[in-house]
């Protein structure tokens, strides 16, 4: 049975040309974290592998960084980065866990973080 | 004590193909990522590829990237790497090694003794 | 990719001397730097790994020290079987790299 939750930095915004934190955390479950994907609609950001450490796909090499711990740093945003963002989490019993997380990237200086929420 | 041995290195002409084994004993093959760590005469070290525990995961270097894949079977405690479309720059020796867990801080810790791979025509 | 950028490329030492050799990484990598020693003809051999801990077996003379991307390895007294390359290594982000190598001679 999956007892884990995901709880997201949830629905954010930003400012053109800056950087955002994408961070997601797995809790409520002793199940093994294998491996943590990172994807944007259905396009591979990233891959943190606890074997092999992480993967940046090769299209998002100059604008993606790892970290700060399972987290993604998106770097030079532009109003085409707005969109939907999902933190897959594979583990060991349970299985697969997916976060989400909405990015609204904002031409002005208006951008604010949004509330956490959680994702059973 | 921890056993890496390499074999199936050898003399192969540009564009050929060889398959590298590396036989493991002493350790519990199946708890260990594994990787490919390859020098050129009188160069420094090149990583090459690695391996999941499980074999579900592998990464390549850009220069091997389409042209190398690397295996594992743990049922036989053996890493492989198949070589194809060689070129003269893969000239060099190709050791197998373990990989401590990314998790646990990383550091290739037991290395084998090496295969060399010579690509001349 | 990450470039490890290690200096001296060489350097010349005598028996009891402090050796210290510096590794810079081209971006950030946390504490994930590896150093290894190899002599020729063998294989390489891993000295520190996660930027400060001693691999198992590894005299107590050999200590690494950094975080993001400065690092250092040090020789606190330069042994006869010391003399060597040196090399450190980022396990941070695929594809993992290595540093061009520090020749550690007799003086």
């Known amino acids: 049975m999956m007892t884990g939750t995901i709880e997201t930095t949830g629905n954010i915004s930003a400012e053109k040309g800056g950087s955002i934190i994408l961070q997601c955390h797995l809790s409520s479950t002793t199940a093994q974290v294998t491996q943590v994907n990172w994807e944007q609609q259905d396009q591979l950001l990233a891959i943190c592998n606890a074997d092999l450490g992480w993967h940046i796909s090769p299209s998002f090499k100059d604008r993606v960084a790892p970290g700060p711990g399972l987290g993604l740093t998106l770097q030079s945003l532009t109003v085409n980065d707005t969109g939907e963002y999902f933190c897959i989490y594979h583990t060991y019993p349970d299985g697969t866990y997916t976060g989400r997380i909405f990015l609204e990237v904002l031409e002005s200086s208006v951008a604010e973080h949004g509330a956490r929420f959680q994702i059973p | 004590e921890v056993q890496l041995l390499e074999s199936g290195g050898g003399l192969v002409q540009p564009g050929g193909s060889l398959r590298l084994s590396c036989a493991a004993s002493?350790?519990?093959?199946?708890?260990?990522?594994m990787t490919w760590v390859r020098q050129a005469p009188g160069k420094g070290l090149e990583w090459v590829s690695g391996i999941s525990r499980s074999g579900g995961s592998t990464y390549y270097a850009d220069s091997v990237k389409g042209r190398f894949t690397i295996s594992r079977d743990n049922s036989k405690n053996t890493l492989y790497l198949q070589m194809n479309s060689l070129r003269a720059e893969d000239t060099a020796v190709y050791y197998c090694?373990?990989?401590?867990?990314?998790?646990?801080?990383?550091?290739?810790?037991?290395w084998g003794q090496g295969t060399l791979v010579t690509v001349s025509s | 990719d990450i470039q490890m950028t290690q200096s001296p490329s060489s350097l010349s030492a005598s028996v009891g001397d402090r050796v210290t050799i510096t590794c810079r990484a081209s971006?950030?990598?946390?504490?994930?730097l590896n150093w290894y020693q190899q002599k020729p003809g063998k294989a390489p051999k891993l000295l520190i790994y996660?930027?400060?801990s001693l691999q198992g077996g590894v005299p107590s003379r050999f200590s690494g020290s950094g975080s993001g991307t400065d690092f250092t390895l040090t020789i606190s007294s330069l042994q006869p079987e010391d003399f060597a390359t040196y090399y450190c290594?980022?396990?941070?982000?695929?594809?993992?790299?290595f540093g061009g190598g520090t020749k550690v001679e007799i003086k």
């Open positions: 971006q950030y990598i946390s504490t994930y």
């Open positions: 002493g350790l519990t093959f199946s708890n260990y990522a």
């Open positions: 996660a930027a400060s």
């Open positions: 090694a373990t990989l401590r867990l990314y998790s646990s801080g990383g550091g290739i810790d037991y």
């Open positions: 290594q980022q396990n941070y982000i695929t594809p993992l790299t």
